[in-house]
């Protein structure tokens, strides 16, 4: 276990700080210029550091179980959870699903009645007594409701001519009835005979298009629970056609723009506003079908078969039947499917925050395991055999009170889980006793709370009137730092700098600012190692011996000796056991300076006074000519000719000697002087 | 305001010791590093010891100890076996919030 602590001073931004993390409540555990957040750390720390076992602050997430009894039947328990979560802490508990035999179902047969689907009407129309005998045979409750659709009522999904709008079918001696986007016709019933008897008023319609509105229906099935009749039991939604269906968006091909809303909108069992609503898309519609437990059964013809296949890849608890040409086998196709539906388990919950995380191991009775997946999946599912599955929920931050339903779709029945912060540290401080605290404040797990006007580890600071503010003034550099560089504590407007973990680093200075670890590196050491410096406030300082920014070299000036012995002929200094030139001079030694002025001009005067003792220096040539000496022998350097204060020319010789602006000079002995005009 | 101030120089013969002090206003010197340069003529500031308030400390030379006492607020240049090449003016020089600050210095000339 890590604890990854940010500023931390008290024990409950310790344990938010991480699963990791605990608190140490020892008192006087911190020593001084130690801050409050070292009594945050991992368990074994803390132990190593000192501090008791039973003054460790550490609490956990936990999860307590509550059957309701009371009640008929249950499919899933527990039917209560309550939570207390830890940051980063994951709770889990388990949640065990027996599939109960004979469970309610009412089932809604949703029916495509474009024109097409003529034969397959005059089937249905027979069926009620078959579809009623079927669900007794695995419930004994059943009910079964009827609807229909085609689709909106607007170019180009049907024909808006008038004669077209009166009868859309392509044979004039058909009775046919004005097409309709979706018309509730039965509500859910257990009477066989009113089923036959309504059905057996409808009449075949059609549009225009291949798609049909089937998704516009599904949306006012799912969202009008007391007009279809829905109960709350198993709910069963079979879906049958032999084509496509429009989806979101394919409104704008009719001029409809505002999307669909997801509410009923049922005005005498029609769908009458379908002209002013897009058709839902896909995941709106998944969702409204979860959110009330209805399970679809899509009964289509084998060539619409995968195209429904893709659609129940993403409503789950969905499944496809091949239905004849004429629906003749839609009975058989209900038993299976729901046989299918009612065999797979998927174990969700409703939306949450994005502070809280829930996974799902599925222990399924076929000794499959499917570990922290997004929700719980079972598949074979046998009646009265418990499947289990283990559900964990971690908070990411210190949550407040909240509840959410755990579900198995398409089942009525739910597990509430309440869900609590587990934030709080229930510290032991013996008393009251604000002795601890120079009677300024009370002691909360371990620290000292002091009362206003009082700071410090003990309350041993009075503010005086000046704000904190002021205070802490005193402990920033500018007002764009932090206080005492985020490494000390400002006690009384003083910066109390902390002790570090880390071995050697000492910190220090008025802000905090300094240490003893932060210099230049040699050989991966600090200023190369204790053997050859030290490292104050970011800058080496060597022993002797050494030199350099990280004391890398040693003190020998051996690189730097002309062959007179002189350090970088006295035209620069010693560096590493290499010449740092002054400006101009050229590597390894000083001696050359190929960009300088020439030096002839400078020292005419002195030419003229140390030989002939004349010129401006004459009386002074000694005090103005300091760094020249005169030869009596003729000197290798840089030859020069200028003209005295006479207007005489002058040769002299300079020899470069050690040091800035120190010549040998050798002077003619005879000057040229020109004769002026008589 | 930060101030610094030098004494105990003077004029010791080779082979001599000497005792600088540097003293400063408030508890500063037990809070921070305090460094000794020296200048002597013609040539640049050079640095001669340095001393952490928790009390590690270093020097160029080992003929030179730095010492502080925190109850006076006073850092020591202990200099013994004075050569006259030691000849210069010595500085304390401290860095406290940020700035640097210098003392106005004290002469240590080693001359027979």
């Known amino acids: 276990q890590e604890c990854t602590k940010f500023k931390v001073s008290s024990c409950r931004e310790c344990i938010e700080s991480g699963p990791g993390c605990t608190w140490c409540q020892k008192l006087n555990f911190t020593g001084p210029g130690d801050p409050d957040s070292i009594r945050c750390d991992t368990r074994p720390q803390l132990l190593m550091r000192g501090c008791a076992a039973d003054d460790i602050m550490d609490p956990t997430s936990l999860a307590e179980t509550q059957e309701d009894h009371n009640g008929g039947q249950k499919q899933l328990s527990p039917q209560k959870v309550t939570l207390y979560l830890r940051p980063g802490q994951a709770a889990a508990f388990n949640v065990t699903f027996r599939r109960a035999k004979g469970y309610p179902i009412d089932l809604y047969y949703l029916m495509d009645l474009s024109y097409s689907m003529l034969d397959d009407l005059r089937n249905v129309k027979k069926l009620g007594g078959d579809l009623l005998r079927a669900l007794n045979e695995i419930t004994e409750s059943g009910r079964i409701g009827f609807g229909s659709f085609v689709d909106k009522t607007v170019l180009p999904f049907v024909n808006t001519h008038p004669d077209k709008l009166r009868n859309p079918c392509p044979n004039k001696e058909k009775e046919c009835q004005p097409p309709f986007a979706f018309r509730h016709v039965l509500k859910l019933t257990n009477n066989s005979n009113q089923f036959q008897t309504e059905v057996g008023k409808q009449l075949i319609s059609g549009n225009l298009d291949a798609p049909e509105g089937g998704l516009d229906a599904m949306m006012q099935v799912a969202a009008c629970p007391e007009e279809i009749g829905w109960r709350n039991v198993t709910r069963l939604l079979v879906f049958a056609t032999d084509d496509g269906f429009h989806f979101a968006g394919d409104g704008k091909l009719g001029a409809i723009l505002t999307p669909n809303d997801g509410r009923c909108h049922l005005e005498d069992n029609l769908y009458k506003r379908s002209n002013e609503f897009d058709y839902p898309s896909v995941g709106q519609l998944a969702h409204k079908l979860a959110e009330n437990n209805i399970q679809p059964i899509f009964a289509v013809t084998s060539r619409m078969v995968k195209t429904y296949e893709k659609l129940t890849e993403i409503i789950p608890k969905s499944a496809v039947g091949e239905l004849s040409e004429d629906s003749s086998n839609v009975v058989h196709l209900i038993k299976n499917a729901y046989n299918k539906l009612s065999s797979r388990v998927f174990l969700d919950h409703n939306a949450l925050p994005d502070t809280l995380k829930v996974t799902y191991d599925s222990f399924c009775s076929n000794g499959v395991t499917h570990r922290n997946q997004p929700r719980g999946d079972c598949d074979g599912v046998q009646i009265n055999v418990p499947i289990t599955f283990q559900v964990k929920v971690t908070a990411t931050e210190c949550i407040q009170e909240q509840s959410f339903v755990i579900r198995a779709l398409g089942f009525t029945d739910i597990v509430t889980v309440q869900v609590l912060p587990q934030c709080e540290c229930r510290c032991r401080d013996q008393s009251r006793d604000r002795s601890l605290c120079h009677g300024k404040g009370f002691l909360e797990c371990g620290i000292c709370r002091c009362d206003t006007g009082y700071i410090g580890k003990n309350c041993e600071c009075q503010t005086q009137g000046r704000s904190s503010q002021e205070l802490e003034g005193s402990c920033r550099k500018d007002n764009n730092s932090i206080i005492c560089s985020g490494l000390g504590d400002c006690v009384c407007g003083q910066c109390l700098c902390h002790t570090s973990d880390v071995p050697g680093k000492l910190i220090y200075g008025q802000y905090c600012e300094c240490d003893t670890i932060n210099c230049e590196r040699y050989n991966g050491q600090v200023c190369g190692g204790p053997g050859r410096g030290l490292c104050f406030c970011g800058k080496c300082r060597c022993h002797p011996g050494f030199e350099g920014s990280a004391c890398q070299c040693e003190r020998t000036t051996e690189g730097c000796l002309n062959p007179r012995r002189v350090e970088c002929s006295g035209r620069g200094r010693c560096r590493c056991n290499v010449c740092e030139c002054h400006s101009g001079y050229q590597l390894p030694l000083c001696q050359e300076c190929p960009g300088c002025p020439s030096p002839c001009g400078k020292y005419i005067s002195c030419a003229e006074c140390l030989k002939f003792e004349k010129g401006p220096f004459g009386k002074n040539c000694s005090a103005a000519c300091p760094g020249l000496q005169l030869s009596n022998n003729p000197v290798k350097g840089r030859t020069c000719k200028e003209r005295d204060s006479e207007g005489c020319w002058v040769a002299y010789t300079l020899e470069q000697q050690d040091g800035m602006d120190r010549y040998l000079i050798y002077v003619d002995e005879s000057r040229e002087c020109v004769a002026g005009p008589n | 305001e930060v101030q610094l101030v030098e004494s105990g120089g003077g004029l010791v013969q080779p082979g001599g010791s000497l005792r600088l002090s540097c003293a400063a206003s408030?508890?500063?010197?037990?809070?921070?590093?305090v460094d000794w340069y020296r200048q002597a003529p013609g040539k640049g500031r050079e640095w001669v010891a340095i001393i952490a308030p928790f009390g590690t400390t270093n020097s160029r030379d080992s003929r030179f100890t730095i010492s502080r006492d925190n109850a006076k607020n006073i850092v020591y240049l202990q200099m013994n076996s004075l050569e006259p090449e030691d000849t210069a003016v010595y500085y304390c020089r401290i860095y406290w919030g940020g700035n640097v600050y210098w003392g106005q210095g004290t002469q240590v000339t080693v001359s027979s």
């Open positions: 408030g508890s500063i010197l037990s809070r921070t590093d």
